[in-house]
Interface confidence: medium
């Protein structure tokens, strides 16, 4: 599976887990059908993948959710992937933003994100979203992953 | 388009036909604007993607339905990407699940599914949907395709 | 970040841009956290990307928009990636529908459309949809991208 | 050690402009991300804008959109603010902050600052 010494595959693809915790980054677990390659990219903290190697990389997310119309904000659902690197400022690499359902008690709806992007050594991409307890974990649901190119 | 004699370029990506079979399997053809790079990916009985490599394989797929809250089930639309290894459980890698729309006769909703997954020598990716009969497969809506890292 | 002299990464990944134009193709720009590897490929009048090389391209666009069911059309909102090559007829590769939101003022929705298409020098790529007017041009909502495999 | 010097600062009429300067030294300063915050007379810390390391990509606060610019010279370690059309709400002390060499969530987004340089804005 190697490209060469010098160039390895680099890839991961990690799971959602439901957490207690209130904050509105998505938590990732290595379990299920996961993928990592190697220790060029690896899972910290459970929540944001971070890279060893300057490059580029194809990152995605996908966040499965269910909301009802009444029971949430006014505000849609966003989820936003998310980059931060050594001596850069966070940026927000890509959202999705679906309106909630009016179907009780909740209605499901999935997002799906991704895209090409420069990362630096060290850099970590991380999932946010506007309320993780609406998040859906059941099995292929909600995922998060990226390769280099 | 070589990668090198021992690394050819993998990929696939077929386009949704329309079945009256009832599985809940979808059925796909090589047809319209299709990829199928060579023989190290075929598609089989017109419903998966079997590849004779082992590796680090991105797979998606891209399903629109058309449905209606009143006419269907309770339950949401649902989209699973399934793996099928030689002697090993079928397993699903990814999910995305939408409610039905209130709109009449029918609404429309796109779904989209991706991930890097280790395939084995012999594995099958195939896609399954709740109702394929409210699949739609007008040109570009429905597709399903891999590439190998 | 080269494979090899002669066979350099090819990337892109470009931000939507509000455009006062009335036409449905989406207006792309470089800037915020985009992605052009090299002139290999570029973007051509902010409306295309165009290749110099052939070969098997990883091509998603992902779009956002804001609508409502009453003050819309009938039609849902529909997203295509077309393909243009030289001497050759324009054509659908991709598409995702829709259907407008009862939500007031609108309701938003996220599109995401990605597969893998074999493309020739000088071929260019665009994205078209039903109503510009309703695509969301914030941070990360919008973009459009390619990679060679 | 890690020092930023700003400077360029005073007193100008509604209308008018000022450029700010930020002196950088102690560190790599082509690396790194930065950017200027202000604090008006008895108010919180606001953000005013960053600048990419390679100065590609900028970002603006809403309030300050379209008057103020912000740029660099990697050659000279040096971080510019040109503010025009000022108004007498952008009175405060500027700062010039370096990003946080801090990765993943909820991490701080600066992590050092100068000592600031006062705009006051009044006819």
């Known amino acids: 599976m190697q490209k060469g010494d010098q160039n390895p595959q680099i890839a991961a693809h990690v799971i959602s887990e439901a957490s207690s915790k209130t904050t509105s980054v998505l938590q990732w677990a290595e379990k299920g059908y996961y993928t990592m390659s190697n220790n060029l990219v690896t899972l910290e903290n459970g929540k944001q993948l971070t890279v060893k190697r300057q490059g580029l990389y194809y990152i995605y997310a996908q966040v499965t959710f269910c909301s009802n119309r009444e029971a949430s904000s006014q505000a849609p659902f966003i989820a936003s992937l998310c980059l931060k690197s050594p001596g850069r400022f966070e940026r927000i690499l890509l959202r999705a933003a679906n309106t909630h359902s009016s179907a009780k008690p909740c209605g499901q709806q999935s997002i799906h994100l991704g895209g090409v992007f420069e990362l630096q050594p060290g850099a970590s991409v991380f999932v946010n979203v506007t309320d993780p307890s609406q998040v859906s974990h059941g099995t292929g649901f909600t995922s998060f992953g990226l390769l280099k190119l | 388009m070589q990668k090198g004699d021992q690394n050819p370029q993998i990929a696939a990506h077929v386009i949704s036909e329309a079945s009256s079979k009832t599985t809940s399997v979808l059925q796909w053809a090589e047809k319209g604007y299709y990829t199928m790079s060579n023989n190290l990916v075929t598609l089989e009985n017109g419903k998966q993607l079997t590849v004779k490599r082992q590796g680090l394989y991105y797979i998606y797929a891209q399903v629109t339905f058309c449905s209606n809250r009143e006419a269907s089930s309770q339950a949401p639309f649902i989209a699973s990407l399934c793996l099928k290894s030689p002697g090993r459980f079928e397993r699903i890698l990814l999910r995305a699940a939408n409610t039905h729309s209130s709109a009449k006769p029918c609404g429309q909703q796109s779904i989209h599914l991706g991930g890097v997954f280790e395939l084995q020598p012999g594995a099958s990716v195939f896609v399954n949907v709740t109702d394929p009969s409210q699949v739609s497969h007008g040109t570009g809506f429905t597709s399903f395709g891999l590439l190998k890292l | 970040m080269q494979k090899g002299d002669q066979n350099p990464q090819i990337a892109a990944h470009v931000i939507s841009e509000a455009s006062s134009k009335t036409t449905s193709v989406l207006q792309w720009a470089e800037k915020g956290y985009y992605t052009m590897s090299n002139n290999l490929v570029t973007l051509e009048n902010g409306k295309q990307l165009t290749v110099k090389r052939q070969g098997l391209y990883y091509i998603y666009a992902q779009v956002t928009f804001c609508s409502n069911r009453e003050a819309s059309s009938q039609a849902p909102f529909i997203a295509s990636l077309c393909l243009k090559s030289p001497g050759r007829f324009e054509r659908i590769l991709l598409r995702a529908a829709n259907t407008h939101s009862s939500a007031k003022p609108c309701g938003q929705q996220s599109i995401h459309l990605g597969g893998v298409f074999e493309l020739q020098p000088g071929a260019s790529v665009f994205v078209n949809v039903t109503d510009p007017s309703q695509v969301s041009h914030g941070t990360g909502f919008t973009s459009f991208g390619l990679l060679k495999l | 050690e890690v020092q930023l010097l700003e400077s360029g600062g005073g007193l100008v009429q509604p209308g008018g402009s000022l450029r700010l300067s930020c002196a950088a030294s102690?560190?790599?300063?082509?690396?790194?991300?930065m950017g200027w915050v202000r604090q008006a007379p008895g108010k919180g810390l606001e953000w005013v804008s960053d600048?990419?390391?390679?100065?590609?990509?900028?970002y603006y606060a809403d309030s300050v959109k379209g008057r103020f610019t912000i740029s660099r010279d990697n050659s000279k370690n040096t971080l510019y603010l040109q503010m025009n059309s000022l108004r007498a709400e952008d009175t405060a002390v500027y700062y010039c902050?370096?990003?946080?060499?801090?990765?993943?969530?909820?991490?701080?987004?600066?992590?050092?600052w100068g000592q600031g340089t006062l705009v006051t804005v009044s006819s």
């Open positions: 902050a370096k990003a946080s060499d801090e990765v993943g969530v909820n991490t701080s987004k600066f992590d050092y």
């Open positions: 102690g560190f790599t300063f082509s690396h790194y991300d």
């Open positions: 600048i990419d390391y390679i100065g590609k990509t900028t």
